[in-house]
């Protein structure tokens, strides 16, 4: 059961797991959440009747029943994880906590203008969990706009005690807003020789991977496969760091892979998911129940559905045993790993689901697409959103995608002549036009946030955001799609996409059905050369033949450009402008979403 | 066939700076770990810098960290070299070429002659 | 850091010899170790890595073996394409050092 609410004056009895220092109930509730085990939590505020050294101490607590006796207790605030809870889950803190010294290893001091430059910092800086400033009116004059950049082993402050005149805050990394470079590159037959902050068991080098991007200390890691020579040491995943935030060396051994912590584009990729399943691979841990499933995938339901589990093994049934159930072992550890993998006793296993809501919904998988033809089907491009305006009579007007579950993103030069967002219509999960009848639901828009910078699309700042009047369900037929990392500008996205319902030729009409053209990216220089009087910038993209043939058109503005990588679609750019549609040597020209990605976070996550 | 070209060298004097260039093709040049070797006039290989594919992490040799700086641009399929405060020991050949998963230098290029000499 | 060392320096042979060139590492690299083959005013060319394994393309007269510190190059049956300066690279950890050449030209 989801249960949101805070208790005010109440402690949970018993079932301590570990005691953290947190700056709000709030955000020991998102502390419990993202701890494998913790399903309750009682925070101590600050209060006369406490005893300071217990004030701000969040107990995280566990227990069979999921449930602890309540205890009355002036200043404790306890309430449940949101493990329990079916919602979207993000660890962004944008906090700042005035008269709060938030404790750790001060590793890094230097002068800053104000908070949010030493939070900046902070977000920049590799090793940087929170951060304390002292505010030009601290007492003592030679600590006057000083940026603390702290960090501690579990990523959460050590102490927090209060202290005048400063302001403290967390890194705002896990909010997509880090300009750290995303270091995605997987090094086989390579060990990196640093410090070990932690070891963990895990499947594969991508589990190890994954562990190491949510963990707070771990800058990179080492994975020794199931062929490792060292029985010992097989499918063992070594969690490091290091002072540069670098492998100072990289050795070769044979059986082994090593990687970077994905932190900086954690928004744009699974990294509490572990979707796998591991044939003839038993997980070991502390068994939490068995129950007979017919299959592997029901056994994983069944882990889902246990709040407790985290993972599970499921051994087949023998010939015609049991109804033709096989056995279901659910299981958890104390870090959420298993605490031994074996290999050769036939066994299938993988991880709860869970936690796959603590990712952005947009790292989902999607079915796949349709090789061929250019029509769409109904849920290829489920982020896609025809936007209709009403007046003088309702007609589509522009193409956009869901980037959150209010909140659509499309191109500027759309709301020419759009007095109101009244007259505005988004339908999603939407294949053909024919499909929108006067009793069709759609999403009405609350409010059109056009960039300040934007005069005409052809120069640039084409993008618009719009806020929905109520929230989107997720379904399979409308989603969102992962805004690119800023860590990633230097990926080559290879799989692009236009889609759309505008003209397929210049002299034309808008199209019943969803059309879709895979079309390469250009760079920059090569599209200048093609477009001489008109300047492209860097905050635009480029794609297109140089034959022409395929191109957005009339129609598809506002809508994607849309980029496979790693398996995750990110939304390149926005079809903004172009000379003609699919003329030779005229590649259409985007909105370069990447350079975009701190307006748009700014504007959606804005309090 | 994998080609990669340098570019960029010539005569600079003590305490210059340089920036050589590798353009490659014939591979797929985002997936592949790059690096730069150099060899001075009748002399051995040294392996000067490597950079990931990504270009999110840099290796140097003792010899040349905090001057030379390695990058590479995935879109225009090319690796750079900038070399600053030269010395009349950075006078080589300067090959570009690709790094394997064998840790082997599998292709190179035909190199760019640097000369610092006053 | 890792040194390596090349033996001879440098070596006669006539074409259909057979020669033997030896490279030692400063400690043991396991069998991490390239083997490159440079003609005069050309790019070297990889020949072998993992001290036995012949890159795509190398004829089967070159091999390689050793492991830990001592390896060694053999080139059968020599021929006239053949004379140019090898150099063997370790491969065990960076930063990346190649031995110092060994010249090979015809008696």
């Known amino acids: 059961e989801c249960v949101t609410q805070l208790l005010k004056d109440t402690c949970f009895e018993g079932g301590d797991i570990t005691t953290v220092f947190t700056p709000s109930a709030k955000y020991c509730q998102v502390v419990c959440t993202y701890h494998p085990r913790c399903l309750l939590f009682t925070f101590t505020a600050e209060s006369p009747s406490e005893d300071p050294t217990r004030w701000f101490t969040c107990v995280l607590k566990d227990s069979v029943t999921e449930t602890l006796p309540r205890v009355n207790r002036t200043a404790a605030i306890s309430g449940y994880s949101f493990k329990q809870c079916s919602h979207q889950i993000s660890a962004c803190n944008k906090d700042i906590y005035v008269d709060l010294d938030m404790k750790g290893i001060n590793y890094n001091s230097s002068v800053a203008k104000s908070a949010q430059e030493c939070q900046e910092r902070c977000t920049d800086d590799v090793h940087c969990h929170f951060f304390t400033y002292a505010t030009r009116q601290f007492p003592s004059l030679e600590h006057r706009n000083i940026c603390l950049l702290k960090h501690t082993q579990t990523g959460t402050p050590t102490r927090i005690t209060k202290l005048d005149k400063v302001v403290s805050g967390f890194s705002l990394k896990s909010c997509a807003l880090s300009n750290l470079a995303c270091i995605r590159d997987i090094f086989p037959n390579t060990v990196f020789a640093d410090s070990n902050i932690d070891s963990v068991m895990a499947p594969d080098a991508f589990v190890c991977g994954r562990i190491c991007t949510h963990h707070p200390g771990c800058l990179f890691f080492t994975f020794f496969s199931q062929e490792w020579p060292k029985e010992s040491q097989r499918n063992l995943c070594l969690l490091k760091t290091s002072e540069s935030g670098l492998p100072s060396t990289r050795i070769k051994k044979s059986k082994a892979l090593s990687g970077f912590s994905l932190q900086s584009c954690r928004h744009s990729i699974p990294v509490f998911c572990h979707s796998s399943f591991y044939h003839d691979t038993d997980f070991l841990g502390e068994e939490l129940d068995i129950v007979a499933a017919k299959s592997h995938e029901a056994c994983q339901k069944l882990c889902t559905n246990a709040v407790r589990c985290q993972f599970f093994t499921y051994t087949p049934a023998q010939a015609s045993c049991n109804e033709g159930k096989g056995k279901c072992y659910l299981k958890l550890s104390s870090n959420g790993s298993p605490t031994k993998i074996l290999h050769g006793r036939g066994g299938i296993s993988g991880y709860t689901l869970r936690l796959c809501k603590m990712d952005n919904e947009c790292t989902t998988k999607i079915k796949p697409r349709i090789v061929g033809g250019t029509a769409s089907v109904r849920g290829e491009w489920p982020w896609q959103v025809t936007l209709h305006t009403t007046s003088p009579t309702q007609r589509h007007l522009c193409g956009g995608s869901i980037i959150g579950n209010q909140w659509i993103l499309t191109a500027a030069h759309c709301f020419y002549g759009v007095e109101s967002p009244k007259i505005l219509r988004v339908y999603s999960g939407i294949l053909n036009q024919s499909e929108i009848k006067e009793d069709t639901s759609f999403f009405g828009v609350q409010e059109i946030i056009i960039h300040d910078q934007y005069k005409m699309a052809e120069s640039g700042y084409d993008i618009a955001l719009l806020k929905l009047e109520t929230t989107v369900n997720y379904t399979d037929s409308q989603r969102p799609i992962c805004l690119p990392s800023k860590g990633d500008r230097n990926v080559i996205y290879t799989d692009c996409w236009v889609t759309g319902w505008g003209y397929r030729k210049l002299r034309d009409k808008i199209q019943n059905t969803l059309q879709k053209a895979k079309i390469p990216l250009v760079t920059n220089e090569e599209c200048q050369k093609r477009y001489r009087g008109h300047k492209i910038t860097h905050k635009m993209i480029c794609a297109g033949y140089r034959e022409g043939g395929k191109d957005a058109c009339k129609g598809d503005s506002g809508g994607p450009l849309s980029c496979k990588h790693n398996e995750v679609w990110h939304l390149v750019g926005i079809t903004s402008w172009g000379e003609g549609c699919a003329q030779r040597e005229r590649p259409g020209v985007y909105t370069n979403v990447v350079e975009y990605v701190d307006w748009i976070l700014e504007k959606t996550q804005a309090v | 066939e994998v080609q990669l070209l340098e570019s960029g060298g010539g005569l600079v004097q003590p305490g210059g700076s340089l920036r050589l260039s590798c353009a490659a093709s014939g591979f797929t040049f985002s997936d592949y770990e790059m690096a730069w070797v150099r060899q001075a006039p009748g002399k051995g290989l040294e392996w000067v810098s490597s950079i990931v594919p990504s270009g999110g992490w840099t290796l140097y040799a003792d010899s040349v960290k905090g001057r030379f700086t390695i990058s590479r641009d995935n879109s225009k399929n090319t690796l750079y070299l900038q070399m600053n405060s030269l010395r009349a020991e950075d006078t080589a050949v300067y090959y570009c070429a690709t790094w394997g998963d064998s840790w082997g230098f599998d292709f190179w290029g035909q190199g760019t002659l640097v000369t610092v000499s006053s | 850091d890792i040194q390596m060392t090349q033996s001879p320096s440098s070596v006669s042979a006539s074409v259909g010899d057979r020669v033997t060139i030896t490279c030692r590492a400063s400690?043991?690299?396991?069998?991490?170790l390239a083997w490159y083959q440079q003609r005069p005013g050309k790019a070297p060319k990889l020949l072998i890595y993992d001290a036995s394994t012949l890159q795509s393309g190398v004829p089967s007269r070159f091999s390689g073996s050793g492991s830990g510190t001592d390896f060694t190059l053999t080139i059968n049956s020599l021929q006239p394409e053949n004379f140019a300066t090898y150099y063997c690279?370790?491969?065990?950890?960076?930063?990346?050092?190649f031995g110092q050449g060994t010249r090979l030209e015809i008696k």
């Open positions: 400690q043991g690299i396991s069998s991490w």
């Open positions: 690279q370790q491969a065990d950890s960076f930063p990346i050092a």
